[in-house]
């Protein structure tokens, strides 16, 4: 049998089983989810789960630049450190950088400080790029 | 191992189009960026644009957005460049390079010459 | 788009000489490569990320720098480093070269 790989929305590009699409816009969070969102496809912002898949949308990323943080799907909606992925997936994998995680900062971004593999709150009103995923 | 291969060298009519090619074998194709800098004989290094093969999404320098096409055929692991309107301006050696965040090495291939004469 | 301007355009060194030359950018950038060529030959590789030396390549070269200026030294030159040294800034698209220094 030949198993045919699904295919992503054009622009967007497939890894184990999802479609990513990077959006140089500016948004803030929820208007950056929103926007995922409206892409359909039951999109999200992303979650990230492992090393590898961190490791494969940074390479992506990299095409475009190396100097902006990307807004990503894993926020505090309680303010109380209880940090959950917006479409619902398994908070296991963690890669904080060292900063601190303090003050009004309540969502997450790549940080460009490590070729995106680390991640750092921040304000949730901040404009950003971001980060959409969905499983086709 | 990782190899790009490119023919030596073209030669075209003004006003003509190409194609040129680099042929990627050694590395999963559609998970790292190709990249296409120009080089006038004598000249510097000049960035085009690159591409992502598994999305095929594009970014160029704006002074090629007009002159240059890049596309990918993932059968073959083959990335194209189009050069369109072709003057003696165009003359070059034209790379195509493999991106790599984490690589201590990159890769290029060996250059075509492209020659614009009539 | 970054443009990036290298000094001195053209250089000579005797053996044994520290040698350094420059990148500027006409804005501040988070990272910057060198390549080396040498006539008739592709490009490759020879620092990236501002500091680390790519594979193969002595110790005795190092990259240095932050926001819009970079340099590239070589602590005591070797026949062998004579060619031509490009940076590229790899921090926002186009990712621009350098015109060159010329070794």
């Known amino acids: 049998d030949i198993i045919m790989r699904p295919s992503c929305a054009p622009g967007w590009f497939y890894h184990k089983s999802n479609c990513y699409g990077y959006f140089r816009k500016l948004r803030n969070w929820s208007d950056a989810e929103l926007e995922c969102q409206s892409y359909g496809n039951g999109a999200h912002l992303a979650s990230i789960l492992s090393l590898k898949e961190a490791s494969t949308i940074a390479e992506y990323i990299s095409g475009y630049q190396r100097s902006q943080p990307i807004w990503i799907g894993l926020h505090d909606p309680q303010k109380r450190q209880q940090w959950q992925w917006i479409d619902g997936a398994m908070y296991l994998y963690r890669s904080w950088s060292g900063k601190s995680m303090g003050g009004n900062k309540h969502c997450a971004e790549m940080s460009s400080n490590n070729n995106f593999l680390t991640w750092s709150s921040n304000e949730c009103n901040k404009r950003q790029h971001f980060l959409c995923k969905y499983r086709p | 191992q990782v190899q790009l291969q490119q023919p030596g060298s073209e030669l075209v009519r003004p006003g003509a189009s190409v194609k040129l090619s680099c042929k990627a074998s050694?590395?999963?194709?559609?998970?790292?960026?190709m990249h296409w800098v120009k080089q006038r004989p004598g000249q510097g290094l000049e960035w085009i644009g690159n591409?992502?093969?598994?999305?095929?999404?594009?970014n160029y320098d704006e002074k090629f957005k007009s002159k240059a096409t890049l596309t990918v055929d993932t059968s073959s692991s083959t990335a194209y460049m189009q050069l369109s309107s072709l003057t003696s301006e165009d003359s070059a050696v034209y790379y195509c390079?493999?991106?790599?965040?984490?690589?201590?090495?990159?890769?290029w291939g060996q250059g075509t010459t492209l020659t614009v004469s009539s | 788009q970054i443009v990036l301007t290298q000094s001195p355009a053209i250089m000579s060194a005797s053996p044994g000489e520290k040698v350094t030359m420059t990148c500027s950018a006409s804005?501040?950038?988070?990272?910057m490569h060198w390549y080396q060529q040498k006539s008739g030959t592709s490009p490759k590789r020879w620092i990236y990320?501002?500091?680390k030396l790519a594979s193969g390549v002595p110790a005795r070269f190092s990259g240095s720098g932050s926001g819009t200026s970079y340099s590239l030294t070589i602590s005591s030159m070797e026949a062998e480093d004579a060619a031509t040294y490009y940076c590229?800034?790899?921090?926002?698209?186009?990712?621009?070269f350098g015109s060159g220094t010329k070794l």
């Open positions: 390079t493999r991106g790599g965040l984490w690589l201590r090495v990159d890769y």
């Open positions: 590229q800034q790899w921090s926002s698209n186009p990712f621009t």
């Open positions: 804005s501040s950038v988070s990272y």
């Open positions: 591409i992502y093969p598994g999305s095929g999404s594009t």
């Open positions: 050694g590395y999963t194709f559609t998970s790292y960026w």
């Open positions: 990320d501002t500091s």
